[in-house]
């Protein structure tokens, strides 16, 4: 069971300092941006991280949403990342959900975060290059210290 708590607005970057944003096609991509580019591209660069209390504490349970024309929420259905047109729900009556991730700081690096899927244990949000695109994907942690699954989260409130 997950119950919604408070939300915060954040900019998410990978460790190469590329900014996560939502493209016109509602797809999450990373791109090099100056701070001014990041501001100019809002709200596509501003993510709503909603925190949830968890009946089985396993880290900070969160959803990641964006509000452009409508609110869309990040999903990892069958390990394919997409933004689905939906508000983060107030309650989720399950111990796993495609939209719930556990946000944890990387041991020894308090400013670096990782997001583990609640649906797929051991799978993390990651930034990987596929063809020309730096995509947000879901990836199994295959090695300790894998930088692709680490992010910085900068609060914008």
């Amino acid at each position: 069971y997950f119950g919604k708590l408070e939300s915060k607005l954040s900019v998410i970057r990978n460790l190469n300092d590329q900014v996560l944003f939502i493209d016109q096609g509602n797809r999450p991509l990373f791109e090099d941006m100056t701070d001014s580019d990041c501001r100019d591209n809002a709200p596509r660069t501003i993510f709503i991280i909603s925190m949830y209390k968890d009946s089985q504490p396993r880290g900070m349970a969160v959803t990641i949403s964006v509000k452009c024309e409508k609110i869309s929420t990040l999903s990892c259905e069958n390990k394919i990342i997409s933004f689905k047109e939906m508000n983060p729900p107030d309650n989720i009556k399950d111990t796993k959900s495609d939209i719930i991730f556990f946000q944890r700081s990387v041991p020894g690096h308090d400013n670096k975060m990782q997001f583990e899927s609640s649906s797929y244990e051991g799978y993390f949000l990651a930034c990987e290059k596929e063809r020309d695109l730096f995509k947000l994907i879901l990836k199994k942690e295959d090695e300790l210290g894998d930088r692709s699954i680490m992010f910085t989260v900068q609060n914008e409130d």
């Epitope: 493209d23 016109q24 096609g25 797809r27 069958n78 390990k79 394919i80 020309d132 695109l133 995509k135």
Partner: antibody
Amino acid sequence: QTQLQESGPGLVKPSETLSLTCTVSGGSISSRVYYWGWIRQPPGKGLEWIGSIYYSGSTYYSPSLKSRVTISVDTSKNQFSLKLSSVTAADTAIYYCAREDSSAWVFEHWGQGTLVTVSS
Amino acid sequence: EIVLTQSPDTLSLSPGERATLSCRASQILSRNYLAWYQQKPGQAPRLLIYGISIRATGIPDRFSGSGSGADFTLTINRLEPEDFAVYYCQHYDNSLCSFGQGTKLEVK
């Protein structure tokens, strides 16, 4: 709704170059999240991916056809093109253009296809 | 390069029956980039399923995809007359795409 339309000669002589163009309407070819692909199907046979292009001009080709294929894009005309050199009868096929979605790398919108026959 | 092998080549069933089509990859897929298409005579292929099991927009729920590793299945419950067609699986890996050779679903 994005639509794709193939155009080009239906008959090409052996050893010559096959040239086709795909015109995209109802959406910009310059979208960040789509690639634009060519797929062919010999009569009565299966689908074969030829290659894909990004609006920036980056290309990705099937290893089996790479030495003979060139795909190019013209963003000002919202078109992309296929050239296949040194054709033989084995290149006779229906040629499809399609939009490839990068979220799961699938071809979600297709042209209706054009039959190209290689014969003297 | 990953090779996809579909079986059977032809499947003969009657309307109302369940069809099970198989697609086997030559190695385990590192990502769930496995899709299924339907093609009817004289038409372009149509995307049915992507990400192994996610139905494309407008696809009826009698179509379902499953599988993991290197073995994947397209199941069509309660076959309708319009479901008789050729079905292809498709995979993306390391910038390249490939299709299986197809399974023809015909009326028994």
